[in-house]
Interface confidence: low
């Protein structure tokens, strides 16, 4: 799931920490104010920014889908890391969903690789 273009649905709370931009950019974990004068901290667990930036809003944290486990939570400088549940995997071609791993190999083939969160079981032809 990529949410890099999404911004939070809430406005900046007045109590959030502010500092001054350096050369027009704000550090990771912050976004810039509309007048470009302040850097405002992202809200822990709600939004984040990973790079020096001039974003007007921090990026909204990804929420892991059902069928995924949260490996690490969202911080102000890093998005949530989600991983497919045991027995499922995410294909490069269809990263939007976890697919069930096959339970076994077709006849005439042997298993050489287990199901992982990023790959199905691997089968090769018997010698």
């Amino acid at each position: 799931i990529t949410q890099q273009d999404l911004a939070p649905q809430q406005r900046v709370a007045p109590q959030q920490k502010r500092s001054s931009p350096s050369e027009g950019l704000c550090p990771p974990g912050h976004h810039i104010s509309e007048d470009g004068r302040d850097c405002i901290s992202c809200k822990y667990g709600q939004d984040y920014s990973t790079h020096w930036n001039d974003l007007l809003f921090c990026l909204r944290c990804t929420r892991c889908d059902s069928g995924e486990v949260e490996l690490s939570p969202c911080t102000t400088t890093r998005n949530t890391v989600c991983q497919c549940e045991e027995g499922t995997f995410r294909e490069e071609d269809s990263p939007e969903m976890c697919r069930k791993c096959r339970t076994g190999c077709p006849r005439g083939m042997v298993k050489v690789g287990d199901c992982t969160p990023w790959s199905d079981i691997e089968c090769v032809h018997k010698e």
Epitope: D5, R11, E34
Partner: antibody
């Protein structure tokens, strides 16, 4: 299927007003930011205005600030552009475009066919 | 000087690969921006092609074939759109977009007219 259909364009005299509408269908309108982008005859694209998903935050290009007002009615799945004090240089095809996000990014993933506004005496 | 510079016109033969350039003014740093590309065929509205931030952070527009790909050269402050296996229907105007510093206002490049030579 995402569809954006603009209407309300036409011929207007300098100093006059016009209200453009954009009817949206095929997606949950109330969860997306929206934009107006214009293109003068034979020219490039010029961003005009943007509005976030709820309508609470509105942004304008310097060239239209104080003259144009962007608004939306989420109950009617409609986006509007009220254009006042029109000038000859506002003559263009006006496109309604959907933002990829709830707020406003540079990712305008769906566009309408456009409506032509001509400002001339 | 505009924030984004695109060459006005480029051409290449059918079936070849071409790379379109979008140069960000040097008081900005392309390293912190995504580069967006739009295609506009004559008589049609613009169409979103792709967004490129890095190899691991990019997105393709709806129904946009993988012949269209993005890249960035941070040292040269440039974004690129590569189109492989050029087809007649690729003849169009191509616009890039990036964020202007501390502003949500949307800045488009001036566009590059691509001609596909047969």
């Amino acid at each position: 299927e995402v569809q954006l259909v603009e209407s309300g364009g036409g011929l207007v005299k300098p100093g006059g007003s016009l209200r453009l509408s954009c009817a949206a269908s095929g997606f949950t309108f109330s969860t997306y930011g929206m934009h107006w982008v214009r293109q003068a005859p034979g020219k490039g694209l010029e961003w005009v205005a943007g509005i976030n998903y709820s309508g609470n935050n509105k942004y304008y290009a310097d060239s239209v600030k104080g003259r144009f007002t962007i608004s939306r009615d989420n109950a009617k799945n409609s986006l509007y552009l009220q254009m006042n004090s029109l000038r000859a240089e506002d003559t263009a095809v006006y496109y309604c475009a959907r933002d990829h996000s709830t707020w406003l990014s540079r990712h305008l993933d769906y566009w309408g066919q456009g409506t032509l506004v001509t400002v001339s005496s | 000087q505009p924030v984004l510079h695109q060459p006005p016109a480029m051409s290449s033969a059918l079936g070849t690969t071409i790379r379109l350039t979008c140069t960000l003014r040097n008081d900005h740093d392309i390293g912190v921006y995504s580069v967006y590309w739009y295609q506009q065929r004559p008589g049609h509205p613009p169409r979103f092609l792709l967004r490129y931030f890095s190899q691991s952070d990019k997105s393709q527009g709806p129904q946009v074939p993988p012949r269209f790909s993005g890249s960035k050269d941070v040292a040269r402050n440039r974004g690129y759109l590569s189109i492989s296996e050029l087809q007649p229907e690729d003849e169009a105007m191509y616009y890039c977009a990036m964020g202007a510093r501390s502003s949500v206002t949307h800045v488009f490049g001036s566009g590059t007219q691509l001609t596909v030579l047969s």
